[in-house]
C-alpha cells in the first residue's frame, strides 16, 4: 500500500476541527501579477508581501504594486501601500531585509526616466513606518547590508560606481568608480574589483582587487590580473590570469588579502571555470571545470589553509550553460553532502558523502521501492535525487532537496530508483538518518516543508489543476493525514513558512480565477492545536548519528568525533516549540587513516584507506607556494582532515620546510600590492 495508508497509521484526533479553527484566509485586493514575500526578523511574525501588476499600454508599460504587512505569521494582512506613497516597487531588487533582528527593510522604487537618481523606502521598525530617500545614483544591484552593522549599506550604480551609506541609506557617498563586483567581508571590510580601460567585460582577467577596511577612507590594492574573486568561510579566493597565456589559477588568502598563496589546483582555460561549492571556517569544496563543453568537472577539498587540495569526486555535474549543479549541503547532519555525477553513458547519478568529501557512494535503495527501467539489475540499484539540474531541465520536480539544521537527520527530496536519474514522474523520499537510509514518503511530485523542528511535515501535491487539500505528518513522513483547507480550490503557487523551521504556521499561496478576474489569496494554517502539548523528556530518545555498526567501538565516528542527539520519538505528537535547541553530546574518537586526507602528490586507490604516491610525482621533490615563497613538503602522504577532532591512535608525520625561494608563478606577492587614501 502507499505510504501513510497502512492500518498501523494512527490518526491525529479531531484534527479537522482543530485545523478549521486555525485556518485563516486572506484575499488580496489585487489583480494577479507577481507576488513576493519576505520575513522580517526572526520569530517576530512579521511578513511583507509585495504584489506587482504590469499593464501594457500602447507606448509603455504601466506598473502598479501594493505592499501588505502581517504581524501574526500571515493570518491577517494590512495594506500599507500608503506608507510608500503608492509607489511602484521594482521587484527585480526584491525586498532587502536587514540581518539578524535589525528590523530593517529597504524597498527600491521605480523612477521615471530622466531622473537624477533612484528612490528607496527605508524602515528600521519592522516595516511599521517607511522613510522615502532619493538617491544620488541609479542602483544596479540590491542594497547590501554589512553582516556586522546593519546601518552600513553598499550598492553598485548603473554607472559602475561603488556607493556606501553609514546611516542606513540616509546619506550616500561614492567611494570608487569603475567597480565590477563588490562584497562585504568580515569586520565591515569591503572587497571589490575595478577596471582600468573599457569595462568589466573588456578587462576581465586584467581587473584589480581592492580592499577598504574603513568604508572608503583608504584603500589597498590586494591583487592584479584578476578574473574574479569570491569569499567562503574565512577564505578569500581570487582567480588570476597567468603571465604567459590565457589560463588562470586560484589564489587564496586567509588574512583579508594581505598575503596570498597559490592553491594547488589545476589551472583553467578561457572557457572553463572554478566554483566554490561550499565553504566553512575549516575547509572548502572547490569545483574545477573540465576542458571543453563537457558539463562536468572535478570536486577538490582543501586543507585548513585552503592551499593543498585533494581530489574528492570525478565527473561532477556542473553545466557551463546555465551554471547548474546539484551540489547540496545536507544541513541536518554534519559532514553530509549530496551531488550528481555524469556517468560515461551520459546519464546522471546521485552520490553522497558522509565525511565531508572523503568518500562518495551511491544512495541506498529505499526498502519500499522497486528499481525502474534505468536499472541493469532489478534487485540492485540506488536512489537518485532530483535537484537543480532536474529543475533546470523542466522535469516534474517542484522543489529541491530540503533539510534543516534543527530537524536532525531529516532529508526530503524528489527522486527515482534505478541506475540513474529518470525522466519519469518522480516520487518524494525521506531519510531520517541524514541520508544513510531512505523511504518513499509520497507518491508523485509534491511541495513540502518542515515545521516545529521536524515535529510536523507538510506537503501539497504538485498539480496543474486547482487544489484544496494539504497533507501533514507528525511522525517524520510515515503516516499522512489530509485536510481540506477550503471549499473552493485555488491555483497553487507556493508554500511559505518562516525560515528556520521553528514555526507551526504554514501559508498556502495561490490565486482564484473567475470569469472576469483573478485574485491572490493566502491560507495560513496554524498547527499548534494538533501538537497540543509541549514535548517532555519522555518524548525524546537518544540517537547516535552516523551509526552503521553498533558492535564497533568506533561506530558513529565522523571527522574524529561522534555525536549523540536527543531526538523526538516518531510516536510522540507534541510541540518542540520555538525555543527548541538541538541537544547533542559529542565524544572524541581515536585517529585512524580515515581521519586523514591524502597529501599533495598522493591519492587513495579505490576501496583503500592508504594514501599512495601519484606515479607522475614519484621521486620528485614536492614543492608548493605558500605566501609567495616556495615550500618543500616532507610527507608520508597524509594530512588531517580540516575540522577533524580525533586524538591518539594513528599519527602520520607531516613536515613543511621553507625553501626561502620566490614563487615565480605567484602574481599576488606582497611587493605587487599598494595602498592609497582618499
Amino acid at each position: 500500500s502507499a505510504p501513510g495508508e497502512d492500518e498501523e497509521c494512527g490518526r491525529v484526533r479531531d484534527f479537522v476541527a482543530k485545523l478549521a479553527n486555525n485556518t485563516h484566509q486572506h484575499v488580496f485586493d489585487d489583480l494577479r501579477g507577481s507576488v513576493s514575500l519576505s520575513w522580517v526578523g526572526d520569530s517576530t511574525g512579521v511578513i511583507l508581501v509585495l504584489t506587482t501588476f504590469h499593464v501594457p499600454l500602447v507606448i509603455m508599460t504601466f506598473g502598479q504594486s501594493k505592499l501588505y504587512r502581517s504581524e501574526d505569521y500571515g493570518k491577517n494582512f494590512k495594506d500599507i501601500t500608503d506608507l510608500i506613497n503608492n509607489t511602484f516597487i521594482r521587484t527585480e531588487f526584491g525586498m532587502a531585509i536587514g540581518p539578524e533582528n535589525s528590523g530593517k527593510v529597504v524597498l527600491t522604487a521605480e523612477v521615471s526616466g530622466g531622473s537624477r537618481g533612484g528612490r528607496i523606502f527605508r524602515s528600521s521598525d519592522f516595516a511599521k513606518n517607511f522613510v522615502q530617500t532619493d538617491l544620488p545614483f541609479h542602483p544596479l544591484t540590491q542594497m547590501m547590508y554589512s553582516p556586522q552593522n546593519s546601518d552600513y549599506l553598499l550598492a553598485l550604480s548603473t554607472e559602475n560606481g561603488l556607493w556606501v551609506s553609514k546611516n542606513f541609506g540616509g546619506k550616500w557617498e561614492e567611494i570608487h568608480k569603475a567597480v565590477c563586483l563588490a562584497k562585504w567581508g568580515s569586520d565591515n571590510t569591503i572587497f571589490f574589483t575595478t577596471y582600468a580601460n573599457g569595462s568589466c567585460k573588456a578587462d576581465l582577467g586584467a581587473l584589480e582587487l581592492w580592499r577598504t577596511s574603513d568604508l572608503g577612507k583608504s584603500f589597498k590594492t590586494i591583487g592584479v590580473k584578476i578574473y574574479s574573486f569570491g569569499l567562503g568561510g574565512r577564505f578569500l579566493f581570487a582567480s588570476v590570469m597567468a603571465d604567459k597565456d590565457t589560463t588562470r589559477r586560484i589564489h587564496v588568502s586567509t588574512d583579508q588579502g594581505d598575503t596570498w598563496s597559490m592553491a594547488q589546483l589545476p589551472s583553467v582555460g578561457q572557457e572553463q571555470f572554478y566554483s566554490i561549492l561550499a565553504a566553512n571556517d575549516d575547509m572548502v569544496f572547490m569545483h574545477v571545470d573540465e576542458p571543453g563543453d563537457t558539463g562536468f568537472g572535478t570536486i577538490f577539498t582543501s586543507d585548513d589553509r585552503g592551499i593543498v587540495y585533494s581530489k574528492s569526486l570525478d565527473r561532477h555535474l556542473y553545466t557551463t550553460t546555465g551554471g547548474e549543479t546539484d551540489f547540496t549541503n545536507v544541513t541536518s547532519l554534519r559532514g553530509v553532502y549530496i551531488t550528481s555525477v555524469l556517468s560515461e553513458d551520459n546519464s546522471i547519478q546521485t552520490m553522497i558523502t558522509f565525511d565531508q568529501g572523503g568518500r562518495w557512494t551511491h544512495l541506498r535503495k529505499p526498502e519500499n521501492s522497486e528499481c525502474d527501467a534505468t536499472a541493469k539489475n532489478k534487485n540492485e540499484c540506488s536512489l537518485h535525487i532530483h535537484a537543480s539540474y532536474s529543475i533546470s531541465q523542466k522535469l516534474n520536480v517542484p522543489m529541491a532537496p530540503l533539510s534543516e539544521p534543527n530537524a536532525v537527520g531529516i532529508v526530503i527530496a524528489h527522486g527515482s530508483v534505478g541506475d540513474a536519474i529518470s525522466v519519469m514522474v518522480p516520487d518524494v523520499y525521506i531519510s531520517d538518518d541524514g541520508g544513510y537510509s531512505w523511504t518513499k514518503m509520497l507518491e508523485g511530485p509534491h511541495y513540502y516543508t518542515i515545521l516545529d523542528s521536524g515535529g510536523i511535515i507538510v506537503a501539497i501535491e504538485h498539480s496543474s489543476r486547482p487544489i484544496n487539500v494539504i497533507k501533514f505528518s507528525t511522525d517524520e513522513g510515515q503516516c499522512w493525514q489530509t485536510y481540506t483547507f477550503t471549499r473552493d480550490p485555488i491555483y497553487f503557487t507556493g508554500l511559505a513558512s518562516e525560515p528556520g523551521a521553528r514555526s507551526m504556521n504554514i501559508s498556502i499561496w495561490g490565486f482564484t480565477e473567475s470569469f472576469l478576474t483573478s485574485q491572490w489569496v493566502s491560507y495560513t494554517i496554524d498547527f499548534k492545536d494538533i501538537l497540543e502539548r509541549n514535548c517532555e523528556e519522555k518524548d525524546y530518545t537518544i540517537w547516535l548519528a552516523h551509526s552503521t555498526d553498533p558492535e564497533d567501538y568506533e561506530d558513529g565516528c565522523i571527522l574524529g568525533y561522534k555525536e549523540q542527539f536527543l531526538r523526538l520519538r516518531k510516536s510522540s505528537v507534541c510541540q518542540n516549540g520555538r525555543d527548541y535547541v538541538v541537544t547533542k553530546q559529542p565524544s572524541i574518537c581515536l585517529c585512524s587513516l580515515e581521519d586523514f586526507l591524502c597529501d599533495f602528490g598522493y591519492y587513495r586507490p579505490e576501496n583503500d584507506s592508504k594514501c599512495v604516491e601519484q606515479p607522475e610525482l614519484k621521486g620528485h621533490d614536492l614543492e608548493f607556494c605558500l605566501y609567495g615563497r616556495e615550500e618543500h613538503l616532507t610527507t608520508n602522504g597524509y594530512r588531517k582532515i580540516p575540522g577533524d577532532k580525533c586524538q591518539g591512535g594513528v599519527n602520520p608525520v607531516r613536515e613543511v620546510k621553507d625553501l626561502k625561494k620566490k614563487c615565480t608563478s605567484n602574481f599576488l606577492s606582497p611587493e605587487k600590492q599598494n595602498s592609497k587614501s582618499n
Epitope: 563537457t294 546519464s347 527501467a373 532489478k378 534505478g418 525522466v423 519519469m424
Partner: antibody, heavy 128, light 107 residues
Framework: QVQLVQSGAEVKKPGASVKVSCKAS????????MSWVRQAPGQGLEWMGI????????SYAQKFQGRVTMTRDTSTSTVYMELSSLRSEDTAVYYC?????????????????????WGQGTTVTVSS | EIVMTQSPATLSVSPGERATLSCRAS??????LAWYQQKPGQAPRLLIY???TRATGIPARFSGSGSGTEFTLTISSLQSEDFAVYYC?????????FGGGTKVEIK
C-alpha cells in the same frame, strides 16, 4: 539485419488478458531498451511503457499502471507485454520498438535518439 | 504529461513541392524530439531524432529543425513514396507522448 518480430494477432473477450511477444535479432539484445506503443484503429500512436532488458526493470505510463506487465527473456532475446482486464477500447495494433536512449535523464550534451527499429505490429481485438 | 500538437491535420501537396509540418509541445522538450513516418498497414519508421538529425538511410530531402516547444519537419521536394502520416514524439519527460499526426496527401 536488425529486426523485431512480434507474435500473431489475438482475439480476446473483455476482462481477459493478452500477452504479446517481440523477438529481437541482429543486435545485442541487452544493450537497448524496448518501448511498447499501441495504435487504436484510425487513431494516433500511444506510448505504453519501457523495459530494460538488463535486469528487466520497467516504467509504465500512468494510464496503464496496474494493468500492464512487461517482461523479458534474455536467453531468447524476447520481450513480452501483457495487458490484463481488457476492454473494447484496448482494441489496437501493439508495437514493440527499440529505444536506444532509455529513460535516464541525460547530461547537457546529449539528445534523444528515437525509436529506431519497430516490430511489424500485433493486432489485438477485444470483443464479446 | 507533455501534450504534442501537430498542424495541419491534413496537408495536400503536389509531387515535387515542398511540405512543412509543424509540431508544438506544451512545454519545452529541449531537442528530445523524433519524427516518424507511417504508411497504411505498416509500422512507423524513424526519420529524424534529436530534433534535427536524420536517421540512417533517410533521404536528404527530409530535414528537422526547432528546439524547445516549436519544431518543423520539412520535405523539400515530395516524392510519391512520401505520402503518408507523420508523427512527432517527445522524450523529454515521461511518459513519452506523440502528436496526433499530419496526413500528407496528394493534391
Amino acid at each position: 539485419q536488425v529486426q523485431l518480430v512480434q507474435s500473431g494477432a489475438e482475439v480476446k473477450k473483455p476482462g481477459a488478458s493478452v500477452k504479446v511477444s517481440c523477438k529481437a535479432s541482429g543486435y545485442t539484445f541487452t544493450k537497448y531498451y524496448m518501448s511498447w506503443v499501441r495504435q487504436a484503429p484510425g487513431q494516433g500512436l500511444e506510448w505504453m511503457g519501457i523495459i530494460n532488458p538488463i535486469g528487466g526493470s520497467t516504467s509504465y505510463a500512468q494510464k496503464f499502471q496496474g494493468r500492464v506487465t512487461m517482461t523479458r527473456d534474455t536467453s531468447t532475446s524476447t520481450v513480452y507485454m501483457e495487458l490484463s482486464s481488457l476492454r473494447s477500447e484496448d482494441t489496437a495494433v501493439y508495437y514493440c520498438a527499440r529505444d536506444p536512449s532509455g529513460i535516464a535523464l541525460a547530461g547537457p550534451a546529449s539528445r534523444y535518439y528515437g525509436m529506431d527499429v519497430w516490430g511489424q505490429g500485433t493486432t489485438v481485438t477485444v470483443s464479446s | 504529461e507533455i501534450v504534442m500538437t501537430q498542424s495541419p491535420a491534413t496537408l495536400s501537396v503536389s509531387p515535387g513541392e515542398r511540405a512543412t509540418l509543424s509540431c508544438r509541445a506544451s512545454q519545452s522538450v529541449s531537442s528530445n524530439l523524433a519524427w516518424y513516418q507511417q504508411k497504411p498497414g505498416q509500422a512507423p519508421r524513424l526519420l529524424i531524432y534529436g530534433a534535427s538529425t536524420r536517421a540512417t538511410g533517410i533521404p536528404a530531402r527530409f530535414s528537422g529543425s526547432g528546439s524547445g516547444t516549436e519544431f518543423t519537419l520539412t520535405i523539400s521536394s515530395l516524392q510519391s513514396e512520401d505520402f503518408a502520416v507523420y508523427y512527432c514524439q517527445q522524450a523529454r519527460l515521461g511518459p513519452w507522448t506523440f502528436g496526433g499526426g499530419t496526413k500528407v496527401e496528394i493534391k
